[in-house]
């Protein structure tokens, strides 16, 4: 059989984005087809598909590190360490590291994607017209400061969390990890990996900013990608952080 | 202890970090603040961290090199190479490979950085704003040579710094430095170590074009960072031509 | 030696890099310059070596599989596989892995320089011109739909297409490689790899698009650069296809 | 240092036209420097006329009905404004004045040299 | 095209004085790109050409004594003359260079008492 281990992520990976891609697809093309006539079929190959990359990387970042909650509140329920795990939360576990390279993977293609969207003809073609419209509405100054903020910093999350997941991969590579001792291997695999989750969620929030309450954003009374994509990582660090309450953590670390 | 051969690197790249923060905040943000009320504050989380990132990459890579260049100092010095190097400058040579590694993952942050900037929204403003005020100057033509042909040469140049950089950062992964000879390695290490080094150089020197003897860009009396990033590249390099020199060569090789 | 196995695939890329190169310099900068007098050599640092790169990426990449091809040819012909290659194939078979490499090396660089477009100062005072154009020609609306469509679509491809490459270069290597099966191993250096030179060559073809029947583009009575990068892997795709025709593939399977 | 002469002025029929002048020495008018004329009437206060930019490209103030000109001869170092259909309301000292090039972190800035002025007088 | 309003016309006021100019703008003059206004102030005496003050709203031209400075920001600004000098007795005049046509107030004509 071929990738034992890379059977679970991929189908994991296949069913959001598809999921996603179709969601996208109806929020952002089907809808203004059906509402108003407008063709937006030309978002397809960049600007759907980069709304999906970043939901289904978040997503696997968020299960590489759901087992372990899920996993400590089984130990704390059961009182000790030597009851065995149920075997689908086995099978999880033994493919984290699947999961979390599947996220990078899918991280820098986002990435590449994002960094793509200004070489665009219709990039250009929209700038062109913003410009005649400002002229035409003899508006000298086009900055919307509360705008600018919001994507200075979450450009700049972004590419931060990136760097880490790409340090967390090139650990992954057999021989480097085998230079690591496992306590700096469990280390950056653990410490750095909740980095990295945190700043991407921090990240997706950023994105948000304000289109929470924008009734807009809420086409067909469907919340945007970014609702839905922050929140299992967003559990998944709350478990974590309650997890690493003094009290919970000692209780852990005797199991 | 954790990741021992990897302290001296981080902690001489945190301060270079810091440092090169504070002063470019300085420069860039407290400056404009205190002479004139201009509120820079959105420049902090792209193009302040921007202006951090090449100056350590560039140092830490001269730093890569420098330990070489005071070794063969040494030798010279002392006429044998069976001399024991002073403890700072041992621990420095064995500590090579990961200020290499670090410059380069500087240098992949400040690419991604770099190209980021064109997809920011305050990017896009500004756009709009020349757009407009080009109109409003019934000018027809924007183009400004001599700032065409610095900015397509360093770009380049980068780029190509950076892609050597990447091969020897990928000739580090353990497996395949050990699929290479001794020699193979050491030619690698070496000599495309420096020509990277010698492309960043110009890359940065490029960068500053005519802004050496630009009066604005002295701000409160102090330099532009490429002047001081340039700095200690430019030594490294000058001696590295010094001991290629036949005469020191020679005397070296015999050593 | 240094390298013996790169030897070749260096070379045959020196070789396609230079002539490439001057073939772009002389449609792209010389025949302006001897024609109208227009001044274009700053497109050299950038435009020209972007021209270059994916041009020796796609070529390099059909000749890692075009050697199978021959093989297959070969064996069929022979009616055996126990009859020993020539030993240029022989040589050419075992340098594959090396082709593939600096196929992915160039196609990296052609990814950076691509996403570097729009930061060039070139680039900005071109667009505030044709913002500018658009304003004196009162011209609403600059979008120009099958163009926006052609650049969205090979966009997607590319970074795809490159994504792909970057997993089999990750795959060699070698204590990835090691870590994998014959088998997975051979699945995706076979079956991904000619994924990815299809998705390299439609991508060229879609960035043609309708410059096939462009009088404009016959500069000199020479063919724009696509229309010769597209024939090898073109070629190299046809025959793949039909060696895995059914009738044909149970033949090569016997043998 | 930069000394802006201006000349040319003097008394002329309404409907006439006029040429001022104003040479430029100490600084090329190629250079990085834009070039403006501004005019003021008796006891008023001053207007813009227009600029010519160190790359050749001009602009006006509207309200003149594109009844003035200006260009420049870079061999000379002299700026021109060419005054056509006089008025007698465009009776002024008329001023050209130096602003830096337009830049693109800056965008404008103020005059900072002027010329002393010459007197142009319309009157029948 | 962009307003620009002095107050008051004119003032009369003797040596050591604090003088306070004003300028209104129609429209804001601050960039906010640039975080810059678009407001100079010029000094002009009787026969003589305008000579520049202050530029970007509270930038001193060098040369210019201390005593002068410029505040405001958006619409509204001020020039103060924190001790009036035998030599500050002229008009000024307050210009804005946010746009095209660029446009200046009416002027202040600063008096002896």
């Known amino acids: 059989e071929l990738f034992p281990q890379w059977h679970l992520p991929i189908k994991i990976a296949a069913i959001i984005a598809s999921l996603t891609f179709l969601y996208t697809l109806l929020r952002e093309v089907i809808h203004p087809l059906a509402t108003s006539h407008q063709q937006y079929f030309y978002k397809i190959p960049i600007l759907v598909i980069n709304k999906v990359l970043p939901m289904v990387s978040i997503t696997l970042l968020a299960l590489v590190y759901l087992p372990g909650v899920i996993a400590a509140i089984v130990q704390l329920h059961n009182g000790t360490k030597y009851k065995k795990f149920p075997h689908w939360l086995d099978k999880w576990m033994l493919t984290r590291k699947q999961f979390g390279l599947l996220s990078f993977f899918f991280a820098v293609l986002h990435a590449i994607y994002s960094l793509s969207y200004p070489m665009r003809r219709s990039y250009r073609y929209k700038l062109l017209n913003w410009a005649y419209q400002q002229v035409q509405q003899n508006k000298e100054d086009a900055w919307i400061e509360h705008d600018v903020w919001r994507m200075e910093i979450y450009v700049s999350l972004g590419i931060v969390g990136l760097a880490i997941l790409a340090l967390l991969a090139v650990t992954s590579i057999p021989s480097v990890s085998d230079s690591l001792t496992w306590r700096e291997f469990h280390y950056i695999q653990s410490k750095l990996g909740i980095v990295s989750l945190l700043l991407g969620t921090i990240h997706a929030l950023i994105f948000a900013w304000n289109k929470w309450i924008d009734i807009k954003q809420f086409v067909w009374y469907t919340p945007p990608t970014f609702m839905i994509a922050v929140f299992l990582p967003v559990v998944v660090l709350i478990f974590k952080s309650i997890l690493f309450l003094p009290c919970l953590r000692k209780k852990i670390l005797k199991i | 202890e954790l990741f021992p051969q990897w302290h001296l690197p981080i902690k001489i790249a945190a301060i270079i970090a810091s440092l090169t923060f504070l002063y470019t905040l300085l420069r860039e943000v407290i400056h404009p603040l205190a002479t004139s009320h201009q509120q820079y504050f959105y420049k902090i989380p792209i193009l302040v961290i921007n202006k951090v990132l090449p100056m350590v990459s560039i140092t830490l890579l001269a730093l890569v090199y420098l330990p070489g260049v005071i070794a063969a100092i040494v030798q010279l010095h002392n006429g044998t190479k069976y001399k024991k190097f002073p403890h700072w400058l041992d621990k420095w040579m064995l500590t090579r490979k990961q200020f290499g590694l670090l410059s380069f993952f500087f240098a992949v942050l400040h690419a991604i950085y770099s190209l980021s900037y064109p997809m920011r929204r305050s990017y896009r403003y500004k756009l709009l704003n020349w757009a407009y005020q080009q109109v409003q100057q019934n000018k027809e033509d924007a183009w400004i040579e001599h700032d065409v042909w610095r900015m397509e040469i360093y770009v380049s140049l980068g780029i190509v710094g950076l892609a050597i950089l990447a091969l020897l950062a990928v000739t580090s992964i353990p497996s395949v430095s050990d699929s290479l000879t001794w020699r193979e390695f050491h030619y690698i290490q070496s000599k495309l170590g420096i020509v990277s080094l010698l492309l960043g150089t110009i890359h940065a020197l490029i960068f500053a074009w005519n802004k050496w003897i630009d009066i604005k860009q002295f701000v409160w009396y102090t330099p532009p960072t490429f002047m001081i990033a340039v700095f200690l590249p430019v030594v490294v390099l000058i001696f590295k031509s010094i001991l290629f020199l036949p005469c020191l060569r020679k005397k070296i090789l015999k050593i | 030696e240094l390298f013996p196995q790169w030897h070749l695939p260096i070379k045959i890329a020196a070789i396609i890099a230079s002539l490439t190169f001057l073939y772009t310099l002389l449609r792209e900068v010389i025949h302006p310059l001897a024609t109208s007098h227009q001044q274009y050599f700053y497109k050299i640092p950038i435009l020209v070596i972007n021209k270059v790169l994916p041009m020796v990426s796609i070529t390099l990449l059909a000749l890692v599989y075009l050697p199978g091809v021959i093989a297959a040819i070969v064996q069929l012909h022979n009616g055996t596989k126990y009859k020993k290659f020539p030993h240029w194939l022989d040589k050419w078979m075992l340098t594959r892995k090396q082709f593939g490499l600096l196929s992915f090396f160039f196609a990296v660089l052609h990814a950076i320089y691509s996403l570097s477009y729009p930061m060039r100062r070139s680039y900005r005072y071109k667009l505030l011109n044709w913002a500018y154009q658009q304003v004196q020609q009162n011209k609403e609306d600059a979008w120009i739909e099958h163009d926006v469509w052609r650049m969205e679509i090979y966009v997607s491809l590319g970074i795809v297409g490159l994504a792909i490459l970057a997993l089999l270069a990750v795959t060699s290597i070698p204590s990835v490689s090691d870590s994998l099966t014959w088998r997975e191993f051979h699945y995706i250096q076979s079956k991904l790899g000619i994924v990815s030179l299809l998705l390299g060559t439609i991508h060229a073809l879609i960035f043609a698009w309708n410059k096939w029947i462009d009088i404009k583009q016959f500069v000199w009575y020479t063919p724009p650069t696509f229309m010769i990068a597209v024939f090898l892997p073109v070629v190299v795709l046809i025959f793949k296809s039909i060696l895995f025709l059914p009738c044909l593939r149970k033949k090569i399977l016997k043998i | 240092e930069v000394q802006l002469v201006e000349s040319g002025g003097g008394l002329v029929q309404p409907g006439g036209s006029l040429r001022l002048s104003c040479a430029v020495s100490?600084?090329?008018?190629?250079?990085?420097?834009?070039w403006n004329w501004v005019r003021q009437a008796p006891g008023k206060g001053l207007e813009w006329v227009g600029y010519?930019?160190?790359?050749?490209?001009?602009s006006y103030n509207p309200s003149l009905k594109s009844r003035f000109t200006i260009s420049r001869d870079n061999s000379k170092n002299t700026l021109y404004l060419q005054m056509n259909s006089l008025r007698a309301e465009d009776t002024a000292v008329y001023y050209c004045?130096?602003?830096?090039?337009?830049?693109?972190?800056?965008?404008?800035?103020?005059?900072?040299?002027w010329g002393q002025g010459t007197l142009v007088t319309v009157s029948s | 095209d962009i307003q620009m309003t002095q107050s008051p016309s004119s003032l009369s006021a003797s040596v050591g004085d604090r003088v306070t100019i004003t300028c209104k703008s129609s429209?804001?003059?601050?960039?906010?790109?640039?975080?810059?206004?678009?407001l100079a102030w010029y000094q002009q005496k009787p026969g003589k050409a305008p000579k520049l003050l202050i530029y970007?709203?509270?930038t001193r031209e060098s040369g210019v004594p201390s005593r002068f400075s410029g505040s405001g920001s958006g619409t509204d600004f001020t020039l103060t003359i924190s001790s009036l000098q035998p030599e500050d007795f002229a008009t000024y005049y307050c210009?804005?260079?946010?746009?095209?046509?660029?446009?200046f107030g009416q002027g202040t004509k600063v008096e002896i008492k």
């Open positions: 004045a130096r602003e830096r090039n337009y830049d693109y972190d800056d965008y404008y800035y103020a005059m900072d040299y």
């Open positions: 100490g600084y090329s008018i190629t250079s990085d420097y834009a």
């Open positions: 010519i930019s160190n790359s050749g490209s001009t």
């Open positions: 429209q804001s003059l601050l960039y906010r790109s640039n975080q810059k206004n678009y």
């Open positions: 970007w709203a509270s």
């Open positions: 210009q804005q260079y946010y746009n095209y046509p660029r446009t």
